[in-house]
Interface confidence: medium
């Protein structure tokens, strides 16, 4: 004598006041879990959204963004305009990254170049609007005599002859 309403399967809802206890979800609606009192309206992928997965009686539609936009938020709840590499999106549209900053993606904000000197390194490749700087070895590492071609021989322990 199970509580049948609580056991209506996914894809149905408890329509207990009619002749059936569980009724199939109407068109353009779904229930992804059992025991639902109502079915949820299917998401519609319109405008800047495009359909990635159609709605079924047991699962909601899934949306992507049309070309030139990218998804933001859980389950692609928003579409944000793409910018070019070397740009960031502002309220006034896409703007070039300021000097000293870069963005290597079509989304997100411009970030400052890495400060190589903070790690005691030198700039090997200069940064651009699209690319971060590449840090190289520190100037000290490059000075003559700083590195030896042959590593020093290990010290022998006293009382042991070489093998």
């Amino acid at each position: 004598l199970q509580d049948l309403c609580s056991n209506c399967p996914a894809g149905t809802f408890c329509d207990n006041n009619r002749s059936q206890i569980c009724s199939p979800c109407p068109p353009n609606s779904f229930s992804s879990a059992g025991g639902q009192r109502t079915c949820d309206i299917c998401r519609q992928c319109k405008g800047v959204f495009k359909t990635r997965k159609e709605c079924s009686s047991t699962s909601n539609a899934e949306c992507d963004c049309i070309s030139g936009y990218h998804c933001l938020g859980a389950e692609c709840s928003m579409c944000e305009q793409d910018c070019k590499q070397g740009q960031e999106l502002t309220k006034k549209g896409c703007k070039d990254c300021c000097f000293g900053t870069f963005n290597d993606q079509k989304r997100g904000i411009c970030r400052p170049w890495t400060n190589c000197s903070l790690d005691g390194k030198s700039v090997l490749v200069n940064g651009t609007k699209e690319r971060d700087v590449v840090c190289g070895p520190s100037p000290a590492d490059l000075s003559p005599g700083a590195s030896s071609a042959t590593p020093p021989a290990p010290a022998r322990e006293p009382g042991h002859s070489p093998q």
Epitope: L1, Q2, L4, S6, N7, P9, N16, Q20, I21
Partner: antibody, heavy 113, light 111 residues
């Protein structure tokens, strides 16, 4: 948590009787699926009706019981079964149950002239 | 109304043995709304299995429910003396009238 049936009696054919299922430790203002089942002496189980407590949902009935038997929630601790036009065939122990997992001990109804 | 035909009506078993009880429904049970109950004389029924194969709380794993649609089986293995009882199947149907039906019962006794 427990259920106790009461109201069972010896009645004459054609009489009416109301059985009460009283719950301890269960609040029927919340949603529970409460059922009545009967068992004639030496016979098997026979489902009568079920109701959602704390709800206006349609009760569920056996076709033979609909119209003559009425299940209802009468308080936050009681569910009743009203029976009319009783005949000898209604002689049985009447059980109430919560979703099949919790049962009362039953109350005996005897219909005899 | 739906009819559940339970077979056999009685079975004589040996301690440590296995018994199987079948239940056939005149209509397909909806979404595995199917249960098995155990009843001993002078006691109310006790839920053993629900949703066709899910063991109720506190019921030993010697009890196993299987089946779907119109055909269901209860298997009791490693039988103990305490298993002597009458077993009932119950089916649930997707209608507000005749929502449930019980099988006629199977009495399990020991040789």
């Amino acid at each position: 948590q427990s259920l106790e049936e009461s109201g069972g009696d010896l009645v004459k054919p054609g009489a009416s009787l109301t059985l009460t299922c009283t719950a301890s430790g269960i609040d029927f203002s919340r949603r529970y699926y409460m059922c009545w089942v009967r068992q004639a002496p030496g016979k098997g189980l026979e489902w009568i009706a079920c109701i959602y407590t704390g709800s206006r949902d349609t009760p569920h009935y056996a076709s033979w019981a609909k119209g003559r038997f009425t299940i209802s929630q009468t308080s936050s601790t009681t569910v009743t079964l009203q029976m009319t036009s009783l005949t000898a065939a209604d002689t049985a122990t009447y059980f109430c149950a919560r979703e099949g997992s919790l049962w009362g001990q039953g109350t005996l109804v005897t219909v005899s002239s | 109304a739906q009819v559940l035909t339970q077979t056999p009506s009685s079975v004589s078993a040996a301690v440590g043995g296995t018994v199987s009880i079948s239940c056939q429904s005149s209509q397909s049970v909806y979404s595995n709304w199917f249960s098995w109950y155990q009843q001993k004389p002078g006691q109310p029924p006790k839920l053993l299995i629900y949703s066709a194969s899910t063991l109720a709380s506190g019921v030993p794993s010697r009890f196993k429910g299987s089946g779907s649609g119109t055909q269901f089986t209860l298997t009791i293995s490693d039988l103990e003396c305490d298993d002597a009882a009458t077993y009932y199947c119950a089916g649930g149907y997707n209608t507000v009238i005749d929502t449930f039906a019980f099988g006629g019962g199977t009495e399990v006794e020991f040789k």
